[in-house]
Interface confidence: low
């Protein structure tokens, strides 16, 4: 018999099915059975861990510890689940050069035969952008495309109005600078930039997910928060009300609490089993 | 607003166990972030000693893993350093602190800090 | 370990310059760092992290820069509060190793 849930590894989770709890010759689901953002489901006699984030196609790229590239941090999430090792964010952008697998100490990169990973030129591409090493110099393209954006005026921490959040990431991009979305609507000096200009600005913002979002926290005069409010919401969205000092979190369904830290058992998933009910 | 507070004894004797609390208000320990303990010996720099994460997984400075436990009280959200053998050298203001989750590990918010003077 | 230095362990400048500290770390730590200032018989605070990015709430005349193995912080505009020590942070492995300290005194 396997010695833990991580030796039923699937390629979509894991399938426990068979596996011998010797006091309730049931193996139950409990808060850790499944770490790393996994979803514990038990069907009859099959404990089974799945992955399914939700993730969307935007192209923010990140490189993990493990010296793999993501396309952007949901799918690295998504691999540390289904792998159930810790997978940290060690930049913005994509890994520069492979580096060696395995465990050791290193917090930002793969840490096997190479003691560390050599730094490229490509290093110096941030905000989005990707970099062309077959340029005799070095070159930073973004191959951002705004055109299909919807309008949701926002006020950038440039002190300048763009037509939505694409076009600061854009514009971030092209002038290799952290520009952060810091309000709804247009400045106040009503300053806008609403094309690609060379002046323009785009920051790898994560709030530029999707417009529908970004619409529906301007209804309720939210703003998503900083960058440096990562994690503070477990399992929901990080929004920061001009009223409030403190950030707010909007939780995803079947969470609750401050930092939708807690399952909200409100919320009834029915497992098809022998079991008659189970909270997934 | 998040604080942490540190509280311990101010004195122990060389080879006995330093034992310090860190109480955290304004946000849960279990729901993110990691919780380091840092120390300062008079008039140096900063040393970090280890971290104790959301989800109760620790790591170690190396200097001290032999001597070094990190622990934690979800009920009371407070996390604990233990230091045992402790010598002359290891005293210093020791200071509890939050650091960020998902790659980046600065520390955004600090105790007041606590001095420990280790003598006989 | 990673060692962080700090080449001048003090400096001497005054209300309203442009100073710069600077950082080295003994390996490419990426971009895996972070700046504090200690002001005297009270705990660290963050200024910068990931190298250039600024803590909510600090003041606009810190700025942050450099990547691999070379980092600099910059007040472009010295005021009184800003007399204190300043250490840099790398968390690119571990254990986490912070530098010397660098003073900031009134000239």
């Known amino acids: 018999f396997p010695t833990s849930l991580s030796d039923c590894q699937t390629p979509t989770g894991w399938n426990c099915s068979g596996y011998d709890d010797r006091e309730n010759d049931l193996f139950l689901c409990d808060t850790n059975t499944c770490k790393f953002d996994g979803e514990c489901l038990r069907i009859g006699d099959t404990v089974t861990c799945v992955c399914q984030f939700k993730c969307n196609n935007d192209y923010v790229p990140v490189c993990g510890s493990n010296g793999e590239s993501y396309q952007n941090e949901c799918y690295l999430r998504q691999a540390a689940c289904k792998q159930q090792s810790e997978i940290l964010v060690v930049s913005e952008g994509s890994c520069a050069t492979d580096a060696g697998s395995g465990s050791g100490d290193g917090v930002h990169e793969g840490s096997g035969e190479t003691s560390q990973k050599e730094t490229s030129t490509c290093d110096i591409c941030q905000f989005g952008a990707e970099c062309d090493e077959d340029a005799e110099d070095v070159w930073c393209v973004c191959n951002i495309d705004c055109s299909q954006t919807n309008f949701n005026p926002l006020c950038a921490s440039d002190g300048k109005s763009y037509d939505n959040a694409c076009q600061i990431k854009e514009a971030s991009c092209q002038k290799q600078e952290k520009i952060e979305v810091m309000s709804l609507g247009r400045c106040q000096d009503n300053t806008t930039t609403t094309t690609k200009s060379e002046d323009g600005h785009y920051a790898r913002t994560d709030y530029a997910e999707n417009a529908n979002k970004l619409e529906e926290s301007a209804r309720e005069h939210h703003i998503p928060c900083p960058e440096h409010y990562n994690g503070f919401c477990m399992h929901g969205k990080c929004e920061h009300s001009i009223n409030m000092q403190e950030p707010s979190c909007r939780c995803d369904a079947g969470y609750t609490g401050q930092h939708c830290e807690k399952k909200d058992y409100s919320v009834l998933y029915v497992v098809p089993g022998p079991v008659r009910f189970q909270y997934v | 607003d998040v604080q942490l507070q540190e509280s311990g004894p101010g004195l122990v004797k060389p080879s006995e166990t330093l034992s310090l609390t860190c109480a955290v208000t304004?946000?849960?320990?279990?729901?993110?972030?990691?919780w380091s303990w840092i120390r300062q010996p008079p008039g140096k720099g900063l040393e970090w000693m280890g971290f104790?994460?959301?989800?109760?997984?620790?790591k170690y400075n190396p200097s001290l893993k032999n001597r070094i436990s990190i622990t934690r009280d979800t009920s009371e959200n407070q996390f604990f350093l233990k230091l045992s053998s402790v010598t002359a050298a290891d005293t210093a203001v020791y200071y509890c602190?939050?650091?960020?989750?998902?790659?980046?590990?600065?520390?955004?918010?600090w105790g007041q800090g606590t001095l420990v003077t280790v003598s006989s | 370990d990673i060692q962080m230095t700090q080449s001048q362990s003090s400096m001497s400048t005054s209300v309203g310059d442009r100073v710069t500290i600077t950082c080295k770390a003994s390996?490419?730590?990426?971009?895996?760092v972070a700046w504090y200032r200690q002001k005297p018989g009270k705990s660290p605070k963050l200024l910068i992290y990931s190298a250039s990015n600024r803590h909510t709430g600090v003041p606009s005349r810190f700025s942050g820069s450099g990547s691999g193995t070379d980092f600099t912080l910059t007040i472009s505009s010295m005021q009184p509060e800003d007399f204190a020590d300043y250490f840099c942070?790398?968390?690119?492995?571990?254990?986490?190793?912070f530098g010397g300290g660098t003073k900031l005194e009134i000239k």
């Open positions: 304004g946000y849960s320990i279990t729901s993110g972030y990691y």
């Open positions: 104790i994460s959301y989800d109760g997984s620790n």
């Open positions: 942070q790398q968390y690119s492995s571990y254990p986490f190793t």
């Open positions: 602190a939050r650091g960020l989750r998902r790659g980046d590990y600065s520390m955004d918010y």
């Open positions: 390996q490419n730590v990426v971009t895996a």
